[in-house]
Interface confidence: medium
């Protein structure tokens, strides 16, 4: 069954915290300020203990406190939630603004940053109201960390609750070639703009960005799904000039061994402007970092209308192949490749233990957790289970 | 919202020549296409033609030689021509647009036109 | 041009069947199929696309798959509304031509 890409749309589950489908156990802090405001009485619309969690230390001018919540298996974040101390509607402590900070394997810890650079998030106005921030670009993790923010010497609390799903994808990372500009009237950004690894050389290694969020490019690169955002935002994109070799190659890291059905890549054909759909894909695979390329590559010839310029995904073919990691070289069929997409159809090999530390229990993909209720600012389908959704012009 | 309008004479003698518009509303024809497809009565669909955003066209070459499409962007209006009908060619025709699915997502309501003397 | 053969040609089921159609395509067109329903008296609408994604606002009882030349398109529990005209179509090579249809009906 050839599925498209994740939808980010569909992914807005509350992942427990309210619930209690997170376990006091997988909720720490930085410190406490007591046992009363300790990291476990954050769940949202909670009263436990004195209602919420409040740090020992001030949050300013340092930034240093944080309640951390792991969430066991990688999930995409798409949204997060935040309220002030409760304490029997007596509370006036909360935080007007924070940071994220997030891991996928609790050694590497990468800031949330959104579309244009921003770290600070608006937080809350009361203790009471629920304010929600759509996380734009989600982020893929397994450990979340709130750092509460204030702009002078006072008390701050925190009751959270984080929306997503699981990461059925599998995909810890991705090393690409730097994006490159491609310069017509205007210039067109190509660079994968919410890459979150190392880049060195032009080499972008360990981390996941644009090629991994669920965003599909339009058929016409200069424009957008996102606002205020510059041409070609929703592409990486790669001149034929600057590869001798004829192709881009691409590694892609797993989570653990799986069988991979296909890859899906999301290109632009746009031909009148140079971008065409790669002529052939050519895959390899291997089991661990250190081991030999496992047999023949795979191959795959792409045919089609090449004078049909509409955006669409190609489905790569991988036959079942097991692997951790997968290399794979696009061949340039013309000026440009384009991407805006990949995703893989895989399951995991039974008995195959996951590749970051600490042993993952099952989790179902779509996690039991309801969305909030009772929000002034939310639009929500009636019942539980159902995907949350951001009103139009609630705070950010 | 989204929204597809055919026009047509209804009814064509033959060997004559048929001229059908499409009128959008609700998107821009630079950013989307717009096909058309025929439906013979009580029959399936045959694509007929496409004109992609940029104003490229690409034919159903069995019907090429009879077939023009072009388009007005800024009255957003596309326009098929077919010739030397026949009453074979008795049919609905439909415009639809693809978008972001590499599919015809949205339909027009179609117009009937019948070859007939 | 490829030939999209489907069959059958028609299906009479009671509400709460489950209901498969096949697509067959005379050369490989990738994933790059189309399923449309069309009811009686109204234009086709889309159902599936990229042989097994679901179109907005479609209920998760129709479902698609396949790959290369063989495509099957799913109900899994029929419902009397789903009353129509289904066609697959190939979005892969121009002409992008369609299978003859398979008309649903209800007992």
């Known amino acids: 069954d050839m599925k498209g890409h994740f939808d980010p749309a569909k992914c807005r589950y509350a992942l427990g915290m309210q619930d209690r489908t997170i376990p006091d156990s997988d909720i720490s802090a930085s410190s406490s300020w007591s046992d009363s405001t300790a990291a476990r009485h954050s769940r949202l619309e909670s009263s436990d203990g004195d209602g919420a969690w409040c740090p020992a230390g001030s949050v300013f001018p340092k930034e240093e406190e944080y309640l951390q919540v792991d969430l066991q298996r990688l999930h995409l974040v798409a949204l997060v939630g935040t309220q002030g101390r409760h304490a029997g509607g007596l509370g006036k402590e909360f935080s007007r603004s924070y940071r994220l900070r997030y891991s996928r394997d609790g050694r590497r810890w990468m800031g949330w940053k959104d579309r244009w650079g921003q770290e600070v998030i608006s937080g809350n106005e009361d203790p009471e109201g629920v304010v929600l921030k759509d996380l734009g670009p989600p982020m893929v993790a397994r450990l979340v960390r709130f750092y509460p923010r204030a702009d002078r010497v006072m008390s701050v609390c925190l009751r959270v609750e984080l929306y997503g799903c699981l990461w059925r994808d599998g995909l810890l990372s991705y090393t690409a070639p730097v994006g490159q500009t491609m310069y017509l009237s205007e210039a067109v950004y190509l660079n994968d703009s919410t890459y979150d690894g190392h880049t060195v050389g032009g080499l972008q290694y360990g981390g996941l960005g644009q090629l991994a969020d669920g965003v599909v490019g339009l058929d016409d690169f200069r424009k957008s799904q996102e606002l205020r955002v510059w041409p070609g935002y929703d592409y990486v994109g790669w001149s034929n000039h600057s590869f001798s070799s004829g192709y881009v190659e691409m590694e892609f890291e797993f989570d653990r061994l799986r069988a991979f059905q296909a890859m899906q890549v999301h290109c632009n054909n746009m031909h009148t402007l140079g971008a065409r759909l790669p002529g052939g894909v050519e895959c390899r695979f291997r089991r661990g970092p250190a081991m030999a390329w496992e047999g023949e590559p795979m191959r795959h010839n792409l045919g089609g209308n090449l004078g049909d310029p509409r955006a669409r995904a190609v489905s790569v073919p991988l036959g079942g192949r097991v692997a951790r990691f997968l290399q794979c070289r696009f061949l340039f069929a013309g000026p440009w490749l384009l991407f805006s997409e990949i995703s893989f159809i895989s399951d995991v090999v039974n008995n195959s233990s996951p590749a970051l530390g600490g042993t993952f229990p099952p989790a179902p993909w779509w996690p039991p957790g309801p969305p909030p209720t009772n929000f002034s600012s939310l639009e929500l389908e009636p019942r539980g289970q159902q995907p949350v959704a951001k009103a139009e012009g609630s705070p950010t | 919202q989204v929204q597809l309008k055919e026009s047509g004479p209804g009814l064509v003698a033959p060997s004559q020549s048929l001229s059908i518009t499409c009128t959008v509303s609700?998107?821009?024809?630079?950013?989307?296409?717009i096909h058309w497809v025929r439906q013979p009565p009580g029959k399936g669909l045959e694509w007929l033609v496409v004109?992609?955003?940029?104003?490229?066209?690409t034919y159903n070459s069995a019907l090429k030689s009879r077939l023009s499409i072009s388009k007005d962007n800024s009255k957003s209006q596309v326009f098929l021509k077919m010739n030397s009908l026949q009453t074979d060619d008795t049919a609905i025709y439909y415009c639809?647009?693809?978008?972001?699915?590499?599919?015809?997502?949205?339909w027009g309501q179609g117009t009937s036109v019948t070859v007939s003397s | 041009s490829i030939v999209m053969t489907q069959t059958p040609k028609f299906l009479l089921v009671s509400a709460g069947d489950r209901v498969t159609i096949t697509c067959k395509a005379s050369?490989?067109?990738?994933?790059?199929v189309v399923w449309y329903q069309q009811k009686p008296g109204q234009s086709p609408k889309l159902l599936i696309y990229?042989?097994?994604s679901r179109y907005t606002g479609v209920p998760d009882r129709f479902t698609g798959s396949g790959y290369g030349t063989d495509f099957t398109f799913t109900i899994s529990t029929v419902q009397a509304e789903d009353l129509a005209v289904y066609f697959c179509?190939?979005?892969?090579?121009?002409?992008?031509?369609f299978g003859g249809g398979t008309k649903l009906e209800i007992r």
């Open positions: 004109i992609w955003s940029d104003g490229s066209t």
């Open positions: 990229y042989a097994s």
């Open positions: 050369q490989s067109v990738s994933n790059d």
């Open positions: 609700g998107f821009s024809l630079t950013s989307y296409h």
């Open positions: 639809a647009r693809t978008g972001n699915f590499y599919a015809m997502d949205y």
């Open positions: 179509q190939q979005d892969y090579s121009s002409p992008y031509t």
